[in-house]
């Protein structure tokens, strides 16, 4: 599932390059392993912002699929309460390209520990 999430992120990156979305998004670029579920939640919430701002059907479908995949991969630990983690709004705001790069990095963390 996580490999498919990375495929979807690449697809979103390609789709966005053909558009002009200059949004800045809350981005966790240095994820601590004990906060990775919280960070994933923030990434997914911000992805929905991309979907809404783009108004693009392909981006919308890909984001929705990505959330479904991530949900299923995290169904056993998605409700784990991680303490001492930053709230999404406390994260640094970065452009979409940097946001997606950081997203791929966190997904790779999940792949490495699964």
């Amino acid at each position: 599932n996580w490999v498919n999430v990375i495929s979807d992120l690449k697809k979103i990156e390609d789709l966005i390059q053909s558009m002009h979305i200059d949004a800045t998004l809350y981005t966790e670029s240095d994820v601590h392993p004990s906060c990775k579920v919280t960070a994933m939640k923030c990434f997914l919430l911000e992805l929905q912002v991309i979907s809404l701002e783009s108004g693009d059907a392909s981006i919308h479908d890909t984001v929705e699929n990505l959330i479904i995949l991530a949900n299923n991969s995290l169904s056993s630990n998605g409700n784990v309460t991680e303490s001492g983690c930053k709230e999404c709004e406390e994260l640094e705001e970065k452009n979409i390209k940097e946001f997606l790069q950081s997203f791929v990095h966190i997904v790779q963390m999940f792949i490495n520990t699964s």
Partner: antibody, heavy 122, light 112 residues
Framework: EVRLMASGGGLVQPGGSLRLSCAAS????????MSWVRQAPGKGLEWVAT????????YYPDSVKGRFTISRDNSKNTLYLQMNSLRAEDTAVYYC???????????????WGQGTLVTVSS | DVLMTQTPLSLPVSLGDQASISCRSS???????????LEWYLQKPGQSPKLLIY???NRFSGVPDRFSGSGSGTDFTLKISRVEAEDLGLYYC?????????FGGGTKLEIK
């Protein structure tokens, strides 16, 4: 008023195939994900398949995965369910349903068609 | 898979009474983004199911306010404050937080 009309049901032998259709009208079909749900005689509801708005993504339970294929033709406002290798336990009324977006709404099936009966028997 | 268990199987009521249907999931159905995709559907005899409640407590358009949904995590409830004749039928809870999406077994609301 949103309209969904399922058709294509009938009697088919075990191992056979059938294609169900669902004609949609009175809404912008391409703006909605769609699902199929079935109900065996005297039994409860079972989710069968979901397809994304553009048709790129599909989801199935293990009970039908590899045998059933959900697809859509947005130019014809029509949803399909191709059912292969049919079994007696696939006998049911099949409903098509419109899905509200996860991102902009509640991810619920807000309107349902009237259903079409599929009977698998020799 | 998430197992959805509804109780009771059958609920005999008098018109005007309050009715309460319970739905329990085998694991939390709060998704990673914090949403709980739990719906309630009503299927009247000989008809297609109809959406009543989505995301635990949101009433679908046109659904009377005597219907209310509540709950969190794994325990959910549908309440009908004053049962009317048109409310009779089969009620199903449904989770679509995790694939495969799953229905409860159904609760038949009938006249006592």
């Amino acid at each position: 008023e949103v309209r969904l009309m399922a058709s294509g049901g009938g009697l088919v032998q075990p191992g056979g195939s059938l294609r169900l259709s669902c004609a949609a009208s009175e809404f912008t079909f391409s703006n909605y994900a769609m699902s199929w749900v079935r109900q065996a005689p005297g039994k409860g509801l079972e989710w069968v398949a979901t397809i994304s708005r553009g048709g790129d993504y599909t989801y199935y339970p293990d009970s039908v995965k590899g045998r059933f294929t959900i697809s859509r033709d947005n130019s014809k406002n029509t949803l399909y369910l191709q059912m292969n290798s049919l079994r007696a336990e696939d006998t049911a009324v099949y409903y098509c349903a419109r899905r509200v977006s996860m991102i902009t709404g509640g991810w619920a099936m807000d309107y349902w068609g009237q259903g079409t009966l599929v009977t698998v028997s020799s | 898979d998430v197992l959805m268990t509804q109780t009771p199987l059958s609920l005999p009521v008098s018109l005007g009474d309050q009715a309460s249907i319970s739905c329990r999931s085998s694991q939390s159905i709060v998704d990673i983004t914090g949403n709980t995709y739990l719906e309630w559907y009503l299927q009247k005899p000989g008809q297609s199911p109809k959406l009543l409640i989505y995301k635990v407590f949101n009433r679908f358009s046109g659904v009377p306010d005597r219907f209310s949904g509540s709950g969190s995590g794994t325990d959910f409830t549908l309440k009908i404050s004053r049962v009317e004749a048109e409310d009779l039928g089969l009620y199903y809870c449904f989770q679509d937080s995790f694939v495969p999406y799953t229905f409860g077994g159904g609760t038949k609301l009938e006249i006592k």
